[in-house]
């Protein structure tokens, strides 16, 4: 999906009002400085591409974050503010339902969510601290 035509300001507002709090609650006191940032993004569409990938794609050591509250709110925001996004996600959602496993917060998941917080920071402050 090409995130170029999303309403970035509306997505930013959704992050600041709710998604950010859910990410922090998931981290349960784990500080951003406890992990190194290894994933970055260069502009807002690129940031959303990386955010989608880290949020919804299973990785080694962190099977699925997609059923977490922050992920469901992220999905809703993208569906509302990115034209045509929800249509591209139907097949992916069906595949995800088949993979669903017991929810376990591993250190790898905490690291992955810390990377997500970094990507969201970059998305929301695209003109600051350019890499």
């Amino acid at each position: 999906y090409d995130f170029t035509n999303c309403d970035f300001e509306k997505i930013k507002a959704a992050y600041l009002s709710t998604i950010s709090k859910d990410l922090i609650t998931y981290m349960s006191g784990t500080k951003s400085t406890e992990f190194n940032n290894t994933v970055s993004c260069s502009n807002r569409p690129h940031c959303l591409t990386e955010i989608q990938s880290l949020t919804f794609n299973p990785t080694a050591g962190c099977a699925s974050l997609a059923k977490e509250m922050f992920a469901m709110k992220t999905k809703a925001a993208l569906a509302i503010w990115c034209p045509g996004y929800s249509e591209t996600q139907i097949n992916a959602t069906q595949a995800m339902k088949k993979r669903r496993k017991r929810k376990v917060t591993t250190n790898k998941c905490l690291e992955q969510v810390s990377q997500l917080q970094g990507l969201w920071r970059r998305f929301n402050r695209p003109l600051l601290k350019q890499q």
């Epitope: 609650t25 006191g29 951003s32 190194n36 940032n37 917080q117 970094g118 920071r121 601290k129």
Partner: antibody
Amino acid sequence: QVQLQESGPGLVKPSGTLSLTCAVSGDSISSDNWWNWVRQPPGKGLQWIGEIFHSGRTNYNPSLKSRVTISVDMSKNQFSLKLSSVTAADTAVYFCARDAPNDYGDYGFFDYWGQGILVTVSS
Amino acid sequence: DIVMTQSPLSLPVTPGEPASISCRSSQSLLHSNEYNYLDWYLQKPGQSPQLLIYLGSDRASGVPDRFSGSGSGTDFTLKISRVEAEDVGIYYCMQALQTPYTFGQGTKLEIK
């Protein structure tokens, strides 16, 4: 409005245990904050003692770690400091402070402080 | 532990004039996220410290815009563009990159 209020004895005997409590109002102790203790000897600078999260996870200053215990009481919305084997060098104003995260999970800035309580170690 | 060193330790300033305080850390406070984990606090006489600046340059809520923070890595500066009488007190820098959090010795700002 968030408020923090330290309480406890103002005088502790050498080799005894200093016990202080910080009552939190306007915020829940079980929110996503770290709750801190900082002290300031008379006429000197600030020293971080340690912190606790509502889960019970703690971080302590290594220089005090063997003598310090910080605990949380969610039912009373407060957290406490115990410092054992005190000496005159532990005489200080003790502050409790809140470390609330920003929107990106950054911690390490104390946005609310108690007014402080002077604890004197003397026989 | 990270050692924080401030200068000057005493700073007499005329009201309306600018003021500048330096803070150096024994190791870099720049995280891989490109943010510096350094705070500035002001402790007014007889009061608790109050947060002025966090993450090196972000002003805390309610802090006048005459206060600004800058710097990166190991060298940081707090600037007051026009000092007012209410700015008197002791200014502390604090590193928040890792525990134990550590403070500078403090800089006492007084009015000439």
